[in-house]
């Protein structure tokens, strides 16, 4: 999906009001020095592409993020504020239902959510290179 035509300001408002708080809740008990951000993004569409990938695509050691509250709210925000996004997700959702697993918060998941917080931070304030 091409995130270029999303309403970035509406997504940002949704992030600040709810999604960010759910991410903080998920990370509660984790030291702020624990994880270094290794995933980066260069502009808002790129940030949303990376956010979608880390939130909804199962990775080795962390298969369960898509059912978390922050993930469901992220999906809702993208469906509302990105034209045509929900249509592209129907097949992906059906595939995800087939491989749904029990929710387990692993250290790998905590690291992945820390990366998500970093991506959202850059989405909110993309630091473009100065000419």
């Amino acid at each position: 999906y091409d995130f270029t035509n999303c309403d970035f300001e509406k997504i940002k408002a949704a992030y600040l009001s709810t999604i960010s708080k759910d991410l903080i809740t998920y990370m509660s008990g984790t030291k702020s020095t624990e994880f270094n951000n290794t995933v980066s993004c260069s502009n808002r569409p790129h940030c949303l592409t990376e956010i979608q990938s880390l939130t909804f695509n199962p990775t080795a050691g962390c298969a369960s993020l898509a059912k978390e509250m922050f993930a469901m709210k992220t999906k809702a925000a993208l469906a509302i504020w990105c034209p045509g996004y929900s249509e592209t997700q129907i097949n992906a959702t059906q595939a995800m239902k087939k491989r749904r697993k029990r929710k387990v918060t692993t250290n790998k998941c905590l690291e992945q959510v820390s990366q998500l917080q970093g991506l959202w931070r850059r989405f909110n304030r993309p630091l473009l290179k100065q000419q």
Partner: antibody, heavy 119, light 107 residues
Amino acid sequence: QVQLQQSGAELVRPGTSVKVSCKASGYAFTNYLIEWVKQRPGQGLEWIGVINPESGDTYYSEKFKGKATLTADKSSSTAYMQLSSLTSEDSAVYFCAKESLTGSSYDYWGQGTTLTVSS
Amino acid sequence: DIQMTQSPASLSASVGESVTITCRASENIYSNLVWYQQKQGKSPQLLVYGARNLADGVPSRFSGSGSGTQFSLKINSLQPEDFGNYYCQHFYETPLTFGTGTKLEIK
């Protein structure tokens, strides 16, 4: 806990340069932008610029291009601001500040470094 | 660059009163506005981000509102510790700029 510890007050001559430091602790230094802000005595806040400690990318206010140079040392978790060709107009308190978890504000500030430029 | 204008520049109020400070942006900044409080000789402290979200530890008597170009910070039932300087700042795009400031004094 998160702390930004700035270097002490400076009294310098006009025409010289000065380097102010901002040592970060209590968080992953490279994950968050560091901003610098100027405040003249009895005046408001003025945004100088920002640095991404991970990449070294910087962005300056037009007014401070050529005046301020921002750098960061990842190994010591320290951000620096060098001010050059100093004049009395540069006399002020300079703050460093860390961007918040959400990237939508500054949640922690240094205590400020007072710079006095006088002959 | 986006200009931020605060009003009033100063105001006097008594403990227990309510006050409102306004901030106007020279162009649409959506909800990308922050409010800080600064006491004499101290660093600024974050009060509100995203125009209406209260920062951690900030008393509920503070509230932010507005979007686009017009914003306000309301303080209900003023307490002695609320007196000082208040600044808005836009967080829309780099370069960021601060408002002109409002000095809140005890009457």
